[in-house]
């Protein structure tokens, strides 16, 4: 009679993570008598996956009933596959021996490859805000995928970005892989509403890629422009000076009025108006009683935006140009603010 052969018909098996892998194995003869064992890997460091004779293998089930006397099908199923299960599996026939069974013949092996989905990409931006025209870096990471082949793209404002570097680790063979990409983005004043998108495409995802996003509103700082203007008011001895604070982001802003270098009033931007591009405008005003001043007055609007060094704009108020009110002197100075 021909010598027993152990046949593993599948050279390779491809399984999605979470699924069940079927590893096929048949023997060509019932002789010699002895159990079958399944191993992952070969050589002295091989890992026992299933032993027909003894042991507890909760993830493994046999395809046919191995207790039947004439059974020659030793195929197994391994449930809930993870990338860590990847490797070459050998079906090995043992000959009954005393005290131990002796390895008789091994199948050629079946390579189990596991396809695993990448995790949702996580996009992170710079720790500190940056102003328009500066270049900032965004990183995108995704983990746990297999096979290694993966596509990553960056988008901003309807366009694909080209200035990025991507690495897939590890470089050699592994049960699963990670991707890390860094994109460089030049900020513009209109980027408050912009998003940076990282897109990962992988064979396991098929119809829909995975995307991670970062809002540039968390990255950008648009510094304000200041304009100080003077308007006459009905009372001849009063002048209304306004400070227009335009196109700033984020909203955190403190304004100080100085008269000849001395602090007159400090206020915080509260009721602001939002522009279409996401930036804010705010206006503060100061009502100056000219009759209280003998000399010209230097009025300064000083703005501290988002913890940055203060910027200021000054306006010289010519006292001589305003005739003194003939009636009794009212309060030396009225101040107020008007947010719009």
């Amino acid at each position: 009679e021909e010598e027993l052969q152990v046949i593993q018909p599948d050279k390779s098996v491809l399984v999605a993570a979470g699924e069940t892998a079927t590893l096929r194995c048949t023997a060509t003869s019932l002789i010699p008598v002895g159990p079958i064992q399944w191993f992952r890997g070969a050589g002295p460091g091989r890992e026992l996956i299933y032993n027909q004779k003894e042991g507890h293998f909760p993830r493994v089930t046999t395809v046919s009933d191995l207790t039947k006397r004439n059974n020659m099908d030793f195929s197994i199923r391994i449930g809930n596959i993870t990338p860590a299960d990847a490797g070459t599996y050998y079906c090995v026939k043992f000959r009954k021996g005393s005290p131990d069974d002796v390895e008789f013949k091994s199948g050629a092996g079946t390579e189990l490859s596991v396809r695993a989905k990448p995790s949702a990409p996580v996009v992170s931006g710079p720790a500190a805000r940056a102003t328009p025209q500066h270049t900032v870096s965004f990183t995108c990471e995704s983990h746990g995928f297999s096979p290694r082949d993966i596509t990553l793209k960056w988008f901003k404002n309807g366009n694909e970005l080209s200035d990025f570097q991507t690495n897939v680790d590890p470089v050699g063979e592994s049960v699963s892989y990670s991707i890390h990409s860094t994109a460089k983005v030049v900020l513009t004043r209109e980027d408050v509403h912009s998003q940076v998108i990282c897109e990962v495409a992988h064979v396991t995802l098929q119809g829909d890629p995975l995307r991670g996003t970062a809002n540039l509103s968390e990255t950008i700082r648009v510094p304000p422009t200041l304009e100080v203007t003077q308007q006459p008011v009905r009372a001849e001895n009063q002048v209304n000076v306004t400070c227009q604070v335009r196109k700033f982001y984020p909203q955190r802003l403190q304004l100080t009025w100085l008269e000849n270098g001395n602090v007159s009033r400090t206020e915080t931007a509260s009721t602001v108006t939002e522009n279409k591009d996401g930036t804010y405008n705010w206006m503060s005003w100061l009502l100056v009683n000219v009759s209280a001043h003998r000399d010209d007055v230097k009025l300064t609007c000083q703005v501290e935006h988002d913890g940055q060094p203060a910027v200021s704009k000054s306006h010289d108020l010519k006292v001589s140009a305003h005739p003194k009110e003939q009636g009794s002197n009212t309060a030396a100075e009225n101040t107020g603010s008007n947010e719009r």
Epitope: N157, G158, T204, G207
Partner: antibody
Framework: QIQLVQSGPELKKPGETVKISCKAS????????MHWVKQAPGKGLKWMGW????????TYAEDFKGRFAFFLETSASTAYLQINNVKNEDTATYFC?????????????WGQGTSVIVSS | DIQMTQSSSSFSVSLGDRVTITCKAS??????LAWYQQKPGNAPRLLIS???SLETGVPSRFSGSGSGKDYTLSITSLQTEDVATYYC?????????FGGGTKLEIK
């Protein structure tokens, strides 16, 4: 060459079940998504959803949740669309279409369409 | 859901004309736009993907352009075999959505 061949026309009564097949050839079936698209008589195209041929997951458009189901017979490289409890408004031509992946998720190859008429 | 609007449902054109069909998305679709041609009784045929990439075997008189929300399909010199309905479709997000279609008819 790549081909998607769909099953023949169906005439059904309201309340019955219809199952349409789409047999793929010329490529590795489990590497590409399978989409389904409805076209009512004289109307435009309406995306119904897609099946991940690798994992078996189904994604349905809002209007097609409930009575519609996508199935696979991977060993035969065949995708199926099943409509349960058919209604008159299900009268349409149904197309299967292969979906790409990588940088292009477009529906690149289409079946010839299967006409379904629901009439009492 | 992303709405796709093809402003003209039909066009009456002459052979040899230059034809432009427009498609507008309700939000950015990042060039993930396809154009399909469908003739009566037939399945749709993919002409253009990625807003501008002509599929293999599609005549060079067809071209696609646009970005962001606005896209265009152009046919430089209309031939008899181009008489069909043309659909745009976005594949940036699920659900995939088609435009209502633009039917080309000969004057």
């Amino acid at each position: 060459q790549i081909q998607l061949v769909q099953s023949g026309p169906e005439l059904k009564k309201p309340g019955e079940t219809v199952k349409i097949s789409c047999k793929a050839s010329g490529y590795t079936f489990t590497d590409y998504a399978m989409h389904w698209v409805k076209q009512a008589p004289g109307k435009g195209l309406k995306w119904m959803g897609w099946k991940n041929t690798e994992t078996g997951e189904s994604t349905y458009a809002e209007d097609f949740k409930g009575r519609f189901a996508f199935f696979l017979e991977t060993s035969a490289s065949t995708a199926y669309l099943q409509i349960n409890n058919v209604k008159n408004e299900d009268t349409a031509t149904y197309f299967c279409a292969r979906g790409g992946y990588g940088s292009n998720y477009v529906m690149d190859y289409w079946g010839q369409g299967t006409s379904v008429i629901v009439s009492s | 859901d992303i709405q796709m609007t093809q402003s003209s449902s039909s066009f009456s054109v002459s052979l040899g004309d230059r034809v432009t069909i427009t498609c507008k998305a309700s939000e950015d679709i990042y060039n993930r736009l396809a154009w399909y041609q469908q003739k009566p009784g037939n399945a749709p045929r993919l002409l253009i993907s990625g807003a501008t990439s002509l599929e293999t075997g599609v005549p060079s008189r067809f071209s696609g352009s646009g970005s962001g929300k606005d896209y265009t399909l152009s046919i430089t010199s209309l031939q008899t075999e181009d008489v069909a309905t043309y659909y745009c479709q976005q594949y940036w997000n699920s659900p995939r959505t088609f435009g209502g279609g633009t039917k080309l008819e000969i004057k």
